[in-house]
């Protein structure tokens, strides 16, 4: 035998306040004959929230047409919603009858809570730069969220990271919660593009979470290789020396030539060029005179990199009336 | 006044998802406070309510198909939609889009689409 | 599901004969059965609702009655453009439901 059915599908209604919630009920049948009622509440001391035919409940709208006949859904939209409405909310099918309505059959009821969304995530990195294949750490804070529950995920360009540490504050009941995370990233030399994410899901959210972003940039310091190469020409009595610094992240780089110890003051050419992976390449010209009764030259390239140490590399130049055999060595 | 046309593929290949539209003209879809329905009929054989959505969003899937169907109403359109997953031959029928009026009776329908299951 | 039992499953009548359709249900469900006319190749057309109420536009020689579970429909006076198949539906419980049709011919 078919009966009627009252569903609620929600056994939780997280709301906000001062938003509109919307309370669902539908039926299965137009039978019995007799209204339905919402109620907050069970027992005798139940709180009326909503009677189609009597009563004046000015923040209670109907979602659908409750005159039609054919009419199954008894849905109900409270607006303004403060602390006080929280409860657990009942709709009721009654029967009619004579002198009144009898109860014939209640929804399961959905529970009213409050609810508040968390905090865009914040995200921040390491004070200092750090060199690749180090780990550095990111943390990632959200707050004023309720309920407690909450899912935070850190992800690499897109990849889940797993080496993360993540507590949520108080422990015990409280009226808001706030979360911290903190994640271990390993960096790759390739990094100076690339992103930690850390994305906050919540309830109150409805299935679109919150993220917030750091760029490695900020935290990397890609240190930079050095060549010093003679040119194969030599143009009259001067000699062409390039002091190539390559793959180099940030930008900020000092370059100094010495000739023979003796630091030159002269200007110098020089290129400087992105990567693809924002690194930077910086090409130093030099051009060295010299004489067939000079002695031979020893020509440093010093490159000081994001206030780091300084890392040099020499050439010797053995300079003859024929050309001999070119010489470099690194020096720290 | 108001009339109803279905739209949409006339086969589908067995396991694919069937798509229809009705496309509601000569009145706004929910403005009276009716219920939109989707109905079909096997080649030969009766009537079958398949199910029916209020511009709300509340709908009421058949039992018998409720795992594979999903109606939806789309208001700016002015049109409401039928999905039908993993089809098999036995889907095979003509589907009708139909408005369930204010007297609970279904008093304007579409004409009704054919779509044949087959690979 | 509400069955909705349609009989007979087709009959043959002369032009300005009365027909009678009926149509039980498996339960009570008090008024709240329609009645539709489908001719080949159409949609179907609603012709009774709320088991009695004539739809708009519907000549009168069709009637509806019964409430409960048998319900009753009549066409006082066939005529030729009444060929058709004749359906009963319940809207008291969802799903919906059809009766199986009963198919009117002219002898």
């Known amino acids: 035998e078919e009966e009627l059915q009252m569903i609620q599908p929600e056994k939780l209604l997280l709301v906000t306040v001062g938003k509109t919630a919307t309370l669902h009920c539908t039926v299965t049948s137009l039978l019995p004959v007799g209204p339905v009622l919402w109620f907050r509440g069970v027992g005798p001391g139940r709180e009326l929230i909503y009677n189609q035919k009597e009563g004046h409940f000015p923040r209670v709208t109907t979602v659908s047409d409750l005159t039609k006949r054919n009419n199954m859904d008894f849905s109900i939209r409270i607006s303004s919603i403060t602390p006080a409405d929280v409860g657990t909310y009942y709709c009721v099918k009654f029967r009619k009858g004579s002198p009144e309505n009898v109860e014939f059959k209640s929804g399961p009821g959905t529970e009213m809570a409050l609810g508040a969304k968390p905090s865009a995530p914040v995200v921040l990195g390491p004070a200092a730069r750090t060199t690749p294949e180090h780990t550095v750490s990111f943390t990632c804070e959200s707050h004023g969220f309720s309920p407690r529950d909450i899912t935070l995920k850190w992800f690499k360009n897109g990849n889940e990271l797993s080496d993360f540490q993540t507590n949520v504050d108080p422990t015990g009941q409280s009226v808001a919660y706030s979360i911290r995370s903190t994640a271990r990233v390993v960096l790759d030399p390739w990094d100076v593009r690339s992103q930690v994410i850390c994305e906050v899901a919540h309830v109150t959210l409805q299935g679109d979470p919150l993220r917030g972003t750091a760029n490695l940039s900020e935290a990397i310091r890609v240190p930079p290789t050095l060549e010093v190469t003679q040119q194969p020409m030599r143009v009259g009595n001067q000699v062409n020396v390039t002091c190539q610094v390559r793959k180099f992240y940030p930008q900020s780089l000092q370059l100094t030539w010495s000739e023979n110890g003796n630091v030159c003051q002269r200007e110098t050419a020089s290129t400087l060029t992105e990567n693809k992976d924002g690194t930077y390449n910086w090409t130093s010209w030099f051009l060295v005179n010299i004489s067939d009764q000079r002695d031979d030259v020893v020509l440093t390239c010093q490159v000081k990199h994001d206030g780091q140490l300084a890392v040099s590399k020499r050439l010797a130049l053995e300079v003859t009336v024929h050309q001999k055999d070119q010489s470099s060595d690194a020096t720290p | 006044q108001v009339q109803l046309q279905e739209s949409g593929p006339g086969l589908v290949k067995p396991s694919q998802t069937l798509s229809l539209t009705c496309t509601v003209s000569?009145?706004?879809?929910?403005?009276?406070?009716?219920?939109w329905a989707w109905i079909r009929q096997h080649p030969g054989k009766g009537l079958e309510w398949i199910g029916y959505?209020?511009?709300?969003?509340?709908?009421y899937y058949n039992p018998s198909l409720k795992s594979r169907v999903t109606i939806s109403v789309d208001t700016s359109k002015n049109q409401f939609s039928l999905k039908l997953s993993s089809v098999t031959a036995a889907d095979t029928a003509v589907y009708y889009c139909?408005?369930?009026?204010?007297?609970?009776?279904?008093?304007?329908w579409g004409q009704g689409t054919t779509v044949t299951v087959s690979s | 599901d509400i069955q909705m039992t349609q009989s007979p499953s087709s009959l043959s009548a002369s032009v300005g004969d009365r027909v009678t359709i009926t149509c039980q249900a498996s339960?009570?469900?008090?008024?709240?059965l329609n009645w539709y006319q489908q001719k080949p190749g159409k949609a179907p057309k609603l012709l009774i609702y709320?088991?009695?109420n004539l739809a708009t536009g519907v000549p009168s020689r069709f009637s509806g009655s019964g409430s409960g579970t048998d319900f009753t429909f009549t066409i006082s006076s066939l005529q030729p453009e009444d060929i058709a198949t004749y359906y009963c539906?319940?809207?008291?419980?969802?799903?919906?439901?059809f009766g199986g049709g009963t198919k009117v011919e002219i002898k």
């Open positions: 139909a408005r369930e009026g204010y007297h609970s009776g279904m008093d304007v």
């Open positions: 000569g009145g706004s879809i929910s403005s009276g406070g009716d219920y």
């Open positions: 959505i209020y511009p709300s969003g509340f709908t």
């Open positions: 339960q009570d469900i008090s008024n709240y």
């Open positions: 709320d088991a009695s």
């Open positions: 539906q319940q809207f008291a419980y969802l799903p919906w439901t």
